[in-house]
Interface confidence: medium
């Protein structure tokens, strides 16, 4: 299911994830009760064409919503996980409220206000960087964009757009935030672990060797202070004190989707019962920050030959 989020007391409008280019009618339901959501605008939550509108949204609206597209030969159902958050008390916008990061390499760059096309908004859109209103002439708001002239690394940060959605004579505030980072010709970015998947469980056989590869990508070109490593129960492998478990010397370099990646391999010479209770963390880090994927081991189930 797809995810959408909004802030308490703001407007939130979402689209049916199954929509595609369909022009057929869309019905919305509360997934847990199967109760149909009305189209009457007098309701705080109502359906308008393929869209579900929360005017305004409340924390208790959080949940899974189902949308059904009814066409003559096929009904398509989509699910949308909606989370309404309380407004953050401080300026630090948590990751779960951030839209995709924008990466700029041009001297003049534009940032698009996320989700704005879903709303009935009127200019101007107000823009803030790290919660401060942008008033320098280098920053120009035009339609749903923020244009930045003479971009430098100092322009990196979290940019919030704020606009008004009008419905039935009432105005509702909407805010959306995304990060902006400046790229070089090549670019360095927050690490992305490509393997193992997040919260992965790997099957192993007691007494047999096991190896787990951790791969992460860091951008293209510069990978200053980029590293991939393993921790066991939050301790660096070398300090864990278990000779059977070793991290391979060196890092294998590779390319994936035109990005530079590193791989570190964790080897267990003979898996024991005790190893199944340990937490293995794959860490990828560079100047932008650190990310970790935790994996656990579980005993491989014997194949039943009956």
């Amino acid at each position: 299911s797809k995810s959408s989020w909004g802030l308490e007391n703001e407007a939130l409008i979402v689209r049916c994830p199954q929509r595609g280019r369909s022009t057929y009618p869309v019905e919305w339901y509360y997934s847990d009760t199967n109760e149909s959501i009305p189209t009457q605008k007098r309701n705080r939550i109502f359906v308008s064409r393929d869209r579900l509108k929360f005017l305004p949204a409340r924390v208790e609206d959080s949940g899974i919503y189902a949308c059904v597209i009814r066409s003559p030969n096929l009904n398509k159902t989509g699910y949308l996980n909606v989370t309404i958050h309380k407004k953050p008390p401080s300026c630090n916008i948590p990751d779960y409220l951030m839209y995709s990061t924008v990466r700029g390499s041009d001297k003049n760059f534009k940032i698009t206000c996320p989700t704005i096309d879903l709303y009935n908004w009127t200019a101007p859109v107000q823009w803030f960087k790290n919660c401060k209103a942008l008033q320098e002439p280098r920053f120009r708001a035009h339609r749903s964009y923020l244009f930045i002239d003479n971009v430098t690394h100092d322009d990196e940060g979290d940019y919030t757009c704020q606009f008004t959605h009008a419905e039935n004579g009432t105005n509702y505030i909407v805010t959306a935030t995304r990060s902006f980072t400046v790229e070089e010709k090549g670019f360095s970015m927050f690490p992305v672990i490509t393997n193992p998947p997040y919260n992965h469980t790997m099957e192993v056989e007691i007494g047999k060797p096991a190896s787990i590869a951790c791969s992460a990508c860091f951008g293209k070109g510069s990978h200053f202070l980029a590293d991939v490593l393993w921790q066991i129960n939050k301790t660096v492998v070398g300090n864990f004190g278990e000779a059977r478990i070793q991290e391979e010397e060196g890092r294998n370099e590779s390319s994936s989707n035109d990005m530079d990646c590193l791989t570190s391999v964790l080897r267990i010479t003979g898996v024991t019962e005790k190893d199944l209770s340990l937490e293995y963390d794959c860490l990828a880090l560079n100047l932008h920050g650190m990310i970790r994927h935790t994996i656990r081991l579980r005993r491989k189930q014997p194949i039943d030959h009956r």
Epitope: H153, E156, E184, K185, F224, L225, V236, L283, L287, M290
Partner: antibody
């Protein structure tokens, strides 16, 4: 205000050991990449080692296998354990934080290490 | 390792002069370059990072430019407190490496 304060330098014989400390304050130490940079008398700057709180470490080839960088985030302190010291390790050792764009944005005042018999 | 070469190794200038120091990298380093000022007996001080971004608190008479392999530090109007040694440093790849330094002396 960001402050870095090195200590532990002194005179040591070739082959000897020394442990440098760097007390940090005024910033989120546990999230920072921290580094040691040295400067031999009358010479230029030479990077020595760097550490991340996740446990990642890097060393200059000239000190690999002899020096160990570590940190104690609960004490906001960076360390450099120097073993098998040589005359060419004589230098002022600076502790520095790595900031935006990979520059060393804050430096300590330095501590002098002299390796001589 | 990436080699960083500064020129000149020293220069004499007067207060009010425009001073330019260059730094060349042995390979393309994009904009991953920093400039430092160091006075005798003191720790280095970061002036410029990412080739052209002025570090907070540094006077605007200092500016950096360039990308790829060739970089320049410019002091638009030299002040008495600017007489010092200047270093460039690349942070494109590990290990970070410094130029050999440029000493700016009073003419």
């Amino acid at each position: 205000e960001v402050q870095l304060l090195e200590s532990g330098g002194g005179l040591v014989q070739p082959g000897g050991s020394l442990r440098l400390s760097c007390a940090a304050s005024g910033f989120s130490f546990s999230h920072a990449w921290m580094s040691w940079v040295r400067q031999a008398p009358g010479k230029g700057l030479e990077w020595v080692s760097v550490i991340h709180s996740g446990g990642s470490t890097f060393y200059a080839d000239s000190v690999k296998g002899r020096f160990t960088i570590s940190r104690d985030n609960s004490k906001n302190t960076l360390y450099l354990q120097m073993n098998s010291l040589r005359a060419e390790d004589t230098a002022v050792y600076y502790c520095a934080r790595i900031g935006k764009g990979g520059g060393f944005d804050y430096w300590g005042q330095g501590t002098l290490v002299t390796v001589s018999s | 390792d990436i080699q960083m070469t500064q020129s000149p190794s020293s220069l004499s200038a007067s207060v009010g002069d425009r001073v330019t120091i260059t730094c060349r990298a042995s390979q393309d380093i994009g904009s991953w370059l920093a400039w430092y000022q160091q006075k005798p007996g003191k720790a280095p001080k970061l002036l410029i990072y990412a080739a052209s971004s002025l570090q907070s608190g540094v006077p605007s008479r200092f500016s950096g430019s360039g990308s790829g392999t060739d970089f320049t530090l410019t002091i638009s109007s030299l002040q008495p407190e600017d007489f010092a040694t200047y270093y460039c440093q690349q942070s494109y790849s590990t290990p970070p490496t410094f130029g050999q330094g440029t000493k700016v002396e009073i003419k």
